[in-house]
Interface confidence: low
């Protein structure tokens, strides 16, 4: 007769690696008498012998997962006792090797020229894919506005025209490499002003011909105002050669005045415009010129350069030492404070902030910053920040407030211009304008209904409709 | 005319550390990236480091991760490489060199002369 | 880990034509690698002679050329000169998880 003998373990568990779906076995064979019984864990957790998702053959020593998923990753133990001497245990882990699949793939996008766009692509796998892009036939590289995100989005900074075209994301792992489906990215072009009319100041009944030049997708128009109306008498000439046109207005001056050149493309159902402005005076004509507070000049910095209008104007203080560090360094800290506010408000009180403290500018005569517009300040305030806002009221109030909002160089909404008194006498936020398309997308932010609508001027810069592909923060 | 003078380089022991400096002139410091580059003696170049003209990302060959850090002082128009924990096999001719652009990973189009780091005990 | 290869020397006889070439120890080279080529003569720092594959640095002579042959990036000098003797490195931006930029060991080229 045998003489009795405690298990041994002669094969002890190793690392398996299996791919999802696919078998993946454990041996732990046991040599002993009388016969054992094995018994398996998974990370210490008892697996039953009816567990279908297994079979567990040869007295115990063989565990085989049958289908295997991404959640049986884990440690698994086999402990065999035969009430001669103690249990002994043998343990390996199971490793789940998965080829890359892309979860969230790209979709086509329809973004403004400017702005921010990301396109999604989600992937999982094991080990984890790394992603790249490729735009049209070549692998896109990575620079200074475009950059592949930890998540594998593609996120492209201050696009540009020359970023339109077909891109795909690949994900590659050891395992292989799985392609999106090519999308579609389209970039639409605000009219924007290349030369703008120049001030003259003539003798009474000279001639003077103001030219402007504007750019676009599709070609804008362009019209003149005098002193706000639409020009009444003077010969315009017109022409139009590739995305450009150039107009130019000839004046018999008897009177001075202020002519506006307005260029505006329509983009689906929306409008963009782009306005510069010059002024005729007459020379006989005696005016007391007030000094200037500062100067016209386009923006350097980095931290608005995506929300301002690009190539546009901006105003500087000259009431600082060194106005361009002096406005660029309030901003950076305003954008610190940002940090603190809601998702919804962030982008709306970015647009605000930069184009308050850096107001669009008419060089002319006189530089002179053009405010944000009353209802544009109003939205910000009631509708996407009307939480931040409140609070920060009243905490203000009672010196409770040290975040979110409360250092932020916000402007009196009350104090500020409206447009529907004068609309070329402040700027609109275009952020506002094609985020009051998807605004039915977010959450509730006050009790009542707020006490503005987001302005929808066909005058306004152009509005669209915000697709998730891209996002302002 | 673009200038890059690289300094800090020296003889120091295993496990020492090391600052170097490298100041720029002759162009708009603040516009470019910037990288550093070395060559051990006898041997060819490798690349150590990258920053873009925002110093908002850092990029280190696998080497020398966690031991070296890339910073730019836009303000003194000067690019630094921390030298930490060094090892023999770091002694070399370090070289600042300018990027063509903006981006981390430009072309190299402009070097400076190179100091030398002896890490030796 | 992924090599960047060049022949280790190369000899030109003056006037002559010579490729020198740039590969990958595991793939090809494209011009999604940026190829960029430097020469470097002993005790000088690097000069830039061509960067993303075939664009020219200012002031490099029109003898140097880059391209892509094969999968390999390749340097072409025409006409050697005595003075284009020197070490010539090939560098590739490499991503694969993470961003860098890799040179060649060099090739060192004679011009006899």
């Known amino acids: 007769e045998k003489l009795p003998k405690a298990p041994v373990i002669t094969t002890p568990l190793e690392t398996v690696d299996a791919l999802v779906e696919e078998v993946a076995t454990f041996m732990c064979a046991v040599e002993s008498y009388p016969q054992p019984e094995i018994s398996w864990t998974r990370n210490k957790i008892l697996i039953k012998l009816f567990d279908t998702r297994y079979s567990i053959r040869e007295n115990g020593q063989l565990l085989t997962i049958l289908s295997v998923e991404d959640s049986d990753d884990g440690i698994y133990c086999c402990t065999a006792n035969n009430g001669v001497g103690g249990a002994v245990e043998s343990c390996g882990a199971l490793q789940v090797k998965m080829k890359p699949k892309i979860t969230r793939p790209p979709i086509n996008v329809k973004i403004i020229e400017g702005l921010k766009a990301v396109l999604p692509c989600t992937t999982m796998g094991n080990p984890k894919p790394s992603v790249s892009w490729i735009k049209g036939d070549s692998a896109l590289r990575e620079n200074s506005r475009i950059a592949v995100l930890e998540s594998g989005s593609l996120r492209i900074h201050n696009v540009q025209k020359e970023d339109a075209g077909q891109y795909r994301c690949v994900a590659k792992n050891s395992l292989g490499t799985a392609y999106s489906k090519l999308v579609k990215l389209e970039v639409e072009v605000f009219a924007r002003i290349l030369r703008a009319p120049e001030s003259h100041n003539v003798t009474f009944g000279s001639f003077v011909t103001l030219r402007c030049t504007a750019i676009g997708m599709p070609v804008p128009t362009i019209s003149w105002i005098e002193n706000g109306n639409a020009v009444s008498s003077g010969s315009i000439q017109e022409n139009v050669k590739d995305r450009v046109i150039d107009s130019r207005l000839q004046l018999f001056i008897t009177k001075p005045g202020l002519y506006t050149c307005i260029a505006t493309n329509k983009h689906g159902e929306k409008f963009s415009t782009a306005k510069a402005a010059a002024t005729v005076s007459i020379a006989e004509w005696s005016k007391s010129q007030k000094e200037s507070k500062g100067y016209c000049a386009q923006y350097r910095g980095e931290v608005c350069d995506a929300v301002l209008v690009k190539d546009s104007l901006v105003f500087f203080n000259t009431s600082y030492p060194d106005p361009e560090e002096a406005q660029e360094l309030l901003i950076h800290t305003a954008w610190n404070e940002l940090k603190a506010v809601s998702p919804l408000c962030r982008p709306a009180a970015e647009a605000l902030l930069c184009n308050h403290l850096f107001q669009e500018c008419s060089p002319g005569v006189l530089p002179t910053p053009m405010p944000i517009c009353r209802e544009y300040c109003l939205a910000v305030k009631e509708l996407f920040c009307a939480k931040e806002w409140l609070a920060m009221e009243g905490k203000t109030h009672r010196g409770l407030y040290r975040s979110g909002m409360h250092f932020l160089p916000v402007p009196e909404c009350s104090k500020l211009p409206s447009m529907h008194q004068d609309p070329t006498a402040c700027t609109r936020l275009p952020y506002l304008d094609y985020k009051k398309e998807n605004i039915t997308t977010f959450p509730s932010i006050t009790s009542s209904k707020p006490s503005v609508d987001i302005p929808n001027l066909p005058a306004s810069t152009s509005s669209f409709a915000v697709s998730p592909a891209y996002s302002m923060t | 005319e673009v200038q890059l003078l690289e300094s800090g380089g020296g003889l120091v022991q295993p496990g020492g550390s090391l600052r170097l400096s490298c100041a720029a002139s002759g162009f708009t410091f603040s516009d470019y990236g910037m990288s550093w580059v070395r060559q051990a003696p006898g041997k060819g170049l490798e690349w150590v480091s990258a920053?873009?003209?925002?110093?908002?990302?850092?990029y280190y060959k696998e080497s020398v991760k966690g031991r070296f850090t890339i910073s730019r002082d836009n303000s003194k128009n000067t690019l630094y490489l921390q030298m930490n924990s060094l090892r023999a096999e770091d002694t070399a001719v370090y070289y600042c060199a300018k990027r063509s652009g903006r981006i981390a990973f430009g072309a190299l189009d402009a070097w400076g002369q190179g100091t030398l780091v002896t890490v030796s005990s | 880990q992924t090599v960047v290869t060049q022949e280790p020397s190369f000899s030109v006889s003056p006037g002559g034509t010579v490729t020198l070439t740039c590969g990958l120890s595991s793939g090809s080279v494209t011009s999604s690698n940026y190829p960029d080529w430097y020469q470097q003569t002993p005790g000088q720092a690097p000069r830039t002679l061509i960067y993303s594959t075939d664009s020219r640095h200012s002031g490099v002579p029109d003898r140097f050329s880059g391209s892509i042959l094969g999968n390999k990036a390749a340097l072409t000098i025409t006409g050697a000169q005595a003075d284009d003797e020197s070490d010539y490195y090939c560098?590739?931006?490499?991503?694969?998880?993470?961003?860098?930029?890799?040179f060649g060991g060099g090739t060192k080229l004679t011009v006899l």
């Open positions: 560098g590739l931006y490499m991503y694969s998880g993470s961003k860098n930029y890799v």
């Open positions: 920053i873009p003209w925002s110093g908002g990302s850092t």
